[in-house]
């Protein structure tokens, strides 16, 4: 059956032979209606990439550099299955390219000019492409030929496989630049030995190199890693201090109509029958015909790449930056310390309008990028298409797990001028009901619920976390008879109450009328029994404070709060009747952009923040008539975080624990991708 066939692309006679053997052995173990293998032979990996894009083949396994080529237009391929190394219990699908230095040296990443460098080899990922790609714009001009520019940047190097005649400085630390183990400074161990012997000041290797060469922790403690933010960390903190995270070996397929489920079904069956130590007659991860045919011999198995993970996310911002710099050779005209404009991520078109207005008023210091969901915005910040946005705590958690950092906190209670330097305790997550109802926290089963959005703090993480510990399962859509929780599956009962309009029904953005704090309260007013919101929501939308038709006649006293002890209290008493304290919303950014984002935002709020009194004739950053566009409307200022500059420290141990517990109920495709 052609639609059940996976056309594997082979790049040599030996690979084609192994592919045929793979095909025949899979036929013998799979049912006739199961997936099958067909073999397509091409001259190179690049030809395979083109063949898959043209629907002449379906899959091929590629190194990271080729995954980058595969992702570029017009190929548009995506990673679907990753080889893993190490054990099944602790599978390694990535390695980290690092810059190792001796602890007793005192320079940072931005002070490498004039130092001596040790590389694994010319054109290799961790030893050359990544470090030189990231340093590319600091190299002296002309940057071509690249080897000459590198030779003029460092005061001496060992770059195995370089041309020692044309570029003697690249072979200064290893005469001849031998391209095999005859050169004592060749490859990973060699580059590390070059540093250890004192020949070089920095070695560009992979994170495991230092552990493979120094079994003793006391010896390892004599070394440190250089981080991209110009700090240093210990060698075991490579996950937080690396030049790039590099995928090892990856199966790619078309982004649309790519048969990824079929490819996974095939490879999953293949590893069951022919994986490590499974079969004598055919081995997936070795071959009598040669090394690394179809798959790496060192692989231990396959893992399915999460569907949300596109090539940009898979390769990572640092890796793509390095490779793009090397390939395209473009740099800003004068690399300065000046901050470039910050690209704000706006959610759907209401936020985009406000962002555009901000952009016009900021004299071009703010630019705007749009996405349809918060998770899509976070992904755009991760891959460099956007720089920053302000997030509810639930999404600060997801952003943090995806490598972003909190930059400034929204403050709601502290009056100026102390606001900017005050760390507030947070706001209260509350459950609001109509005063006329007889609901309590203990009899919510079967009622109609209104939520700000799935994954948000007051509207979801806190109430559902509490509910989970009561009911011990994740079927929240069965607990409530119906509800509106934007971001739920469209056919779920938790989308039934949403108002839309139609194509946007239950979407987690302002196009859904019941989205956000105000939307969830409106849902309660018009259809629901309980709304999970922040403690300020009722006062902010009653007594004529919200001029919209549905809200203008509402009275605060017609609503009450549910307390966890089964009692109810006035909306004026949230301190004595709340579900939990929630961390304030916070601005997040990539680490490399955090300082610029902070500087710019502090400047912008001085011009457009809460000191502006007349928002009818001036642009106001924290104003959107109860819609909470870009920032919460009740923001007084954006405040410095001081030492709360990681998502764990910012959110606090208790909240992180609560959200981590809820992860078993997670519907976040982005979180799944970021924790892959």
């Amino acid at each position: 059956v052609p639609e059940k066939s996976v056309r594997w692309c082979a790049v040599s006679e030996h690979e084609a032979t192994k592919c045929q053997s793979f095909r025949d052995h899979m036929k013998s173990v799979l049912p006739s209606n199961g997936p099958s293998v067909a073999c397509v032979k091409k001259a190179s990996h690049l030809d395979c990439i083109r063949a898959i894009a043209a629907n002449e083949a379906d899959a091929v396994t590629l190194d990271a550099g080729l995954v980058y080529d595969a992702y570029l237009a017009p190929n548009n391929l995506k990673p679907v299955v990753a080889e893993f190394y190490g054990s099944k219990e602790d599978p390694q699908t990535f390695y980290y390219a690092v810059a190792v230095v001796k602890k007793d040296s005192d320079f940072q990443m931005n002070q490498l000019r004039g130092r001596k460098s040790c590389h694994t080899g010319l054109g290799r990922s961790a030893g050359w492409n990544i470090p030189i790609g990231l340093l590319y714009c600091d190299l002296p001009e002309p940057r071509k030929p690249l080897e000459k520019a590198v030779a003029n940047f460092f005061s001496g190097s060992c770059v195995p496989c370089a041309d020692g005649t044309d570029f003697p400085q690249l072979c200064q630390l290893c005469p001849g630049c031998g391209c095999s183990t005859l050169n004592q400074y060749f490859s990973y161990s060699g580059a590390f030995k070059c540093l250890k012997d004192g020949a070089g000041d920095v070695a560009f290797v992979k994170h495991s190199t230092i552990f493979e060469n120094l079994a003793n922790k006391a010896d390892r403690d004599q070394y440190e890693l250089l981080c991209l933010d110009n700090t240093r960390k210990s060698v075991d903190e490579y996950k937080d201090c690396h030049l790039a995270r590099v995928p090892s070996h990856t199966v790619v397929a078309r982004s649309v109509g790519g048969k990824e489920d079929l490819i996974w079904e095939l490879l999953n069956q293949a590893q069951e029958h022919f994986g490590k130590d499974k079969s004598k007659e055919f081995q997936l991860f070795s071959s009598p015909h040669g090394k690394d045919l179809l798959f790496k011999d060192s692989a231990h198995g396959f893992l399915k790449v999460p569907p949300r993970m596109d090539a940009k996310m898979y390769l990572g911002y640092e890796y793509i930056t390095a490779i793009r710099n090397l390939r395209e050779g473009t740099c800003p005209e004068a690399p300065t310390d000046e901050c470039k404009p910050v690209k704000w991520c706006a959610l759907s078109h209401h936020e985009r309008l406000k962002c555009d207005e901000w952009s016009v008023n900021s004299a071009g210091k703010i630019e705007c990028e749009s996405a349809e969901t918060t998770e899509d915005c976070i992904a755009k910040i991760m891959n460099g298409e956007a720089d920053a946005m302000s997030l509810d705590g639930g999404f600060v958690y997801i952003a943090g797990m995806c490598g972003l950092v909190p930059v400034l906190a929204e403050n709601y209670n502290t009056p100026n001028p102390n606001c900017e330097n005050t760390a507030e305790e947070g706001y209260f997550a509350v459950a609001v009901v109509k005063s006329s109802s007889d609901l309590t926290w203990d009899n919510l089963k079967g009622k109609k619920s209104c939520h700000t959005a799935v994954g948000r703090t007051a509207g979801w993480n806190i109430p559902m976390g509490l509910l989970y510990s009561k009911i011990n399962h994740c079927r929240f859509d069965e607990f409530f008879s119906e509800g509106c929780a934007p971001g739920s599956e469209k056919n779920s009962s938790l989308c039934k109450l949403c108002m839309g309009p139609s194509p946007n029904l239950c979407e987690p953005n302002n196009k859904e009328g019941y989205y956000g704090y105000t939307g969830a309260f409106r849902c309660l007013v018009e259809k629901g029994d309980v709304a999970f919101v922040k403690h300020q929501t009722v006062p902010q939308n009653t007594g004529g404070k919200n001029p919209d038709a549905w809200a203008k006649n509402l009275k605060e006293e017609d609503y009450e709060l549910l307390c966890l002890d089964g009692s109810r209290k006035s909306v004026q008493e949230p301190a004595n009747c709340h579900l939990a304290r929630a961390p304030n919303h916070a601005v997040v950014a990539r680490k490399d952009k955090a300082d610029c984002v902070q500087t710019l935002l502090l400047d912008q709020q001085r011009m457009f923040g809460s000191s502006v009194t007349d928002c009818s004739s001036n642009f106001c950053l924290f104003e959107s008539k109860t819609k909470d566009l870009l920032f919460r409307d009740d923001t007084v200022c954006l405040a410095k975080l001081h030492d709360r500059n990681t998502y764990e420290k910012y959110l606090g141990e208790e909240y992180v624990k609560a959200v981590t517990n809820l992860r078993k109920c997670s519907t976040s495709p982005l979180l799944e991708a970021c924790t892959f």
Partner: nanobody, 117 residues
Framework: HVQLVESGGGLVQPGGSLRLSCVAS????????MAWYRQAPGQQRELVAG???????KYADSVKGRFTISRDNAKNTLYLQMNSLKPEDTAVYYC???????????WGQGIQVTVSS
């Protein structure tokens, strides 16, 4: 809310010029920001140019150096002078006052600009 009515569009050859006007039904003197957007078939509506009450301007990269936005508060009118027009400038053009901080989708009829030989 205040009505905004666009005019001045039409068919023009590549390299030609047009001047769009947008007249407001109420005073624009105290409006913080006004802007021109455009929407080509099958595309998202995009910001072309914006102007603040104080006269600061911002332009999309694709129109910089060719288009000029201005406002005449006495006449309650926003203008867009478009020179060196290109086929890719073909779109429906809209003006907005950002619904004065409400950010609602209050768009007028817009005005068609077609650049073709």
């Amino acid at each position: 809310h205040v009505q905004l009515v666009e005019s001045g569009g039409g068919l023009v050859q590549p390299g030609g010029s047009l001047r769009l006007s947008c007249v407001a039904s109420g005073s624009i003197a105290s409006v913080a920001t006004m802007a021109w957007y455009r929407q080509a078939p099958g595309q998202q509506r995009e910001l072309v140019a914006g102007i603040t009450r104080g006269g600061s301007t911002k332009y999309a990269d694709s129109v910089k150096g060719r288009f000029t936005i201005s406002r005449d508060n006495a006449k309650n009118t926003l203008y867009l002078q478009m020179n060196s027009l290109k086929p890719e400038d073909t779109a429906v053009y809209y003006c907005t006052d950002y619904s004065r901080g409400y950010y609602q989708d209050y768009w007028g009829q817009g005005i068609q600009v077609t650049v073709s030989s």
